[in-house]
């Protein structure tokens, strides 16, 4: 901590300007009034202070606002934000999306830091839900943001926010996350017609149940293999050969290249070889003709 020393004569800062970059650390501490700094925070960013000088300015703000900075100061922190610890940020009450954008801009191009993660957490908790504008902003800065959230956190995303989600935002989501997002997408897009609906829902289908896939197979959607490979294995298994053929349309030929990978491999094992042969793709590994198929899971459920 910087020692308390009197400000030399004539050095008392009247405003935050470039002359301050020539001040030593102790002079900044002694000669810059914290209240002046708070009201002129927007100027700090334009001045090439050293990291050591920024430490002094932060210290002054900490003394002035021991309970946490007001939003009027937070919004203009600029590069001083990089000096904040998650503990500092937990004291803040950030409600303005403009403030959030300003601080995310400072960290742009870098991985999400603990400070940014804390800031986002505080902001979303303050809003009570992850609304569309917030989601738009966060995914613009961090495309993987949505998939970094736990299923519990994702439950606060209202269906209306799903319109802001782009396919690339879901690239790293696992099935548990898609289980939460898919029903929201299903609700959000339900007023669209068949082909438009499929375009929007496609990236969320890794969370779809069997019956929805069966229904989609009646809609001539022509699902691509990349989407099919991301479907839940247990949702694909009950589909018949005819249903998969309808679901994939012209892309059904791609099954051959994927026959050793899940969910195609497991699905093949559940189909009668006779039925697989009707596809004319040379898929092997189905149930031989004449064998009786017992669905043990159903037996268990019925007993």
């Amino acid at each position: 901590e910087v020692e308390k020393t009197a400000c030399p004569s004539g050095k008392k800062a009247r405003e935050i300007d470039e002359s301050l970059i020539f001040y030593k650390k102790w002079e900044l501490e002694a000669c810059v009034d914290a209240a002046l700094l708070a009201t002129q925070m927007d100027r700090v960013n334009a001045i090439p202070f050293t990291y050591e000088q920024l430490d002094v300015l932060k210290h002054k703000l900490d003394e002035l606002y021991p309970q946490g900075y007001p939003e009027s100061v937070i919004q203009h922190l600029g590069y001083l934000f990089l000096k904040m610890s998650p503990e500092d940020i937990r004291k803040w009450n950030v409600t303005s999306l403009e403030t959030l954008k300003a601080l995310l801009e400072v960290n742009k191009g870098h991985e999400m830091s603990p400070q940014v993660a804390t800031l986002i957490d505080r902001f979303v908790k303050g809003r009570g839900q992850l609304d569309k504008d917030t989601l738009d902003t966060l995914t613009a800065f961090y495309p993987g943001y949505l998939c970094s959230l736990s299923p519990e956190e994702l439950s606060s995303v209202p269906p209306s926010s799903i319109w802001a989600v782009r396919p690339q935002d879901l690239d790293t989501c696992d099935p548990r996350q898609l289980d939460v997002l898919y029903p929201k997408a299903r609700l959000a897009f339900q007023n669209m017609n068949g082909s438009e609906y499929f375009v929007k829902i496609q990236s969320f289908l890794g969370g779809a149940p069997t019956e929805d896939l069966k229904a989609l197979s009646q809609q001539n959607v022509s699902m691509d293999l990349a989407t099919f490979m991301k479907l839940r294995t247990d949702a694909v298994l009950p589909l018949t050969v005819a249903e998969v053929q309808k679901l994939l349309g012209p892309h059904v030929e791609g099954l051959k290249a994927e026959e050793r990978h899940r969910p195609v491999r497991d699905w093949i094992l559940r189909q009668r070889q006779d039925d697989l042969d009707t596809l004319g793709l040379g898929l092997q590994g189905g149930i031989p003709n004449g064998y009786l198929v017992l669905d043990l899971s159903m037996q268990e459920a019925l007993s």
């Epitope: 209306s160 029903p183 339900q190 007023n191 229904a215 009950p238």
Partner: antibody, heavy 122, light 107 residues
């Protein structure tokens, strides 16, 4: 043909936890979303929440803090726990299946259990 | 949440006549509306979804219309088995909400 059957105590004391189970027979629990809906005597219907077989849930905000919905795929069952009950929670509780094959989208119910009356009283 | 209001609370109609039940939403639900019939001691039964599409096995005398905030269930020629309580339900947004019901009784 798929059938639903609710089971659980018919009487629960105030401040205790109401626990009900819905058994799905004649079909797999994995294919649909499953909901709980309740109806106080002589009143209308209130949606409590749904569950997917993976365990993913969504509940009515008016009850969220007191509701836990869970699933046991090995038994083809899903359950409801409602904590800190009061007389206002006295109702017939139904389990229901969210519609499947009728449409790709739609959160309404094409199959219902017969319902079970739960009375909250000391 | 979206509040669904049904009217009238009770409707008295003679067998063979037409019954018209109304349901109003506090904000637009597009066509995301279902109608159910409930008889004493029974679970509700799905009649209509998508505001106007009859569910499997529902007789043609039941028809639904409307979109946005105003919806109607019409039973063209009442049969004795049609006297029951009817509920509308919106599924445009969560939480899913139901109307308070209209009791259809024999006049």
């Amino acid at each position: 043909q798929v059938q639903l059957q609710e089971s659980g105590p018919g009487l629960v004391k105030p401040s205790e936890t109401l626990s009900l189970t819905c058994t799905v027979s004649g079909g797999s629990i994995q294919n649909y979303y499953w909901s709980w809906v309740r109806q106080p005597p002589g009143k209308g219907l209130e949606w409590i929440g749904y569950i997917f077989y993976s365990g993913s849930t969504n509940s009515n905000p008016s009850l969220k803090s007191r509701v836990i919905i869970s699933v046991d795929t090995s038994k083809n069952q899903f359950s409801l726990k409602l904590s800190s009950v009061t007389a206002a929670d006295t109702a017939v509780y139904y389990c229901a299946r969210e519609v499947g094959r009728i449409a790709v989208a739609g959160w309404f119910f094409d199959l219902w259990g017969r319902g079970t009356l739960v009375t909250v009283s000391s | 949440e979206i509040v669904m209001t049904q009217s009238p609370a009770t409707l008295s109609v003679s067998p063979g006549e037409r019954a018209t039940l109304s349901c109003r939403a506090s904000q637009s639900v597009n066509s995301n509306l279902a109608w159910y019939q409930q008889k004493p001691g029974q679970a509700p039964r799905l009649l209509i979804y998508g505001a106007s599409t009859r569910a499997t096995g529902i007789p043609a005398r039941f028809s639904g219309s409307g979109s946005g905030t105003e919806f109607t269930l019409t039973i063209s020629s009442l049969q004795s088995e049609d006297f029951a309580v009817y509920y509308c339900q919106q599924y445009n947004n969560w939480p899913l909400t139901f109307g308070q019901g209209t009791r259809l009784e024999i006049k």
